[in-house]
Amino acid sequence: EPERCNFTLAESKASSHSVSIQWRILGSPCNFSLIYSSDTLGAALCPTFRIDNTTYGCNLQDLQAGTIYNFRIISLDEERTVVLQTDPLPPARFGVSKEKTTSTSLHVWWTPSSGKVTSYEVQLFDENNQKIQGVQIQESTSWNEYTFFNLTAGSKYNIAITAVSGGKRSFSVYTNGSTVPSPVKDIGISTKANSLLISWSHGSGNVERYRLMLMDKGILVHGGVVDKHATSYAFHGLTPGYLYNLTVMTEAAGLQNYRWKLVRTAPM
């Protein structure tokens, strides 16, 4: 008849797809079983190996991420229970929808993590790594996206996503995106026969530079670039009484926005 075991837990650790457990038998040799189970798996025997005279272990691979596994070391009907949770995994893909980006909003999307996830934490940081906004979104098979509003136009942002399962968090994955810069406001034109003086007022948010283009039937005739502080620009050497298409482009954070206007030089 086997003796009842007296055991103590020596070590337990978990990663996203594996767990390792070690325990020590105190006193004389005895018989035991190590059983593991999860809410979806059912019970199974954990293959045990001997480390030394008193220490035993079990390593399990290919487990589901973010899942709670119950381990029971049982000798006759005496048992010690150890609860281990595998680490959740972040989404495999995470990005910004450029087509849904506006001057004041960024739309992010992700593919669901493999394994078990209870929620996702999505955080928005500015260029200086200061947290601007954060949100916790309950896991859903149908809703793997989020839009950040009330942002500054023409700004670069870093976005982090972290999967949460129970009390554990995955490592974070990052993506970046930029809001579209605001276009200029109140374009003013002062016309002469051979020149045009263009003036404007700044829109909201950040600007890196202004690009001005004077087009004739879709062909660039004159162009110039000015810094973000400028509010005017002059085109010279133009044809008197001629109709041009004027575009004032705002550039920031790798994106552009513009306003355009039809302008005519003064006749001779």
């Epitope: 079983s33 059912g42 019970a43 005496e78």
Partner: antibody, heavy 122, light 107 residues
Amino acid sequence: EVQLVESGGGLVQPGGSLRLSCAASGFTFNANAMNWVRQAPGKGLEWVGRIRTKSNNYATYYAGSVKDRFTISRDDSKNSLYLQMNSLKTEDTAVYYCVRDYYGSSAWITYWGQGTLVTVSS
Amino acid sequence: DIVMTQSPDSLAVSLGERATINCKASQHVGTAVAWYQQKPEQPPKLLIYWASTRHTGVPDRFSGSGSGTDFTLTISSLQAEDVAVYYCQQYSSYPFTFGGGTKVEIK
């Protein structure tokens, strides 16, 4: 050698009560979980319930068909297992087996008694 | 409760031939499945535990396999003494439950 001997079976009227006993020997009774399993004449096996050890607070578990009517208990000082059956129905007619199970050496082993017949009939 | 569905209900196999009995669990039970052999007027005898481990003294013509929800007991070469009813049982979660049994006879 593990021995499990059931007793207390017999004829009882519907609505009546009966108490079955199981005398255990050949193993450390107080360290083992114990079960009752029954088998109606010509039918299959049905697990009735299980009682765990003192260190597990003598926790009991039952099949839905007997819950609130049957009670499993044990007396470790007498190496005995009991099944108190109340509000008996004709469908409780069966041979009742006392079963020891234990986990040891990566095993799950069961030992069975010879059974005692309970007949519920008017 | 976890329902264990055995198939077939009965099986007639020639001596020396293979007999295969299936057991399907209504939900995952891992490998916490035992197989029993019961002969007339006798209590069941444990053959296999943890789905595939033979109990001490059980001939090696008996083997078990499966995990999750689908389990199989195979008698590789049927002998006259193997005529019996065979039951599967899950002990993954309470209440423990048995399959309905499969009667194995000689053809």
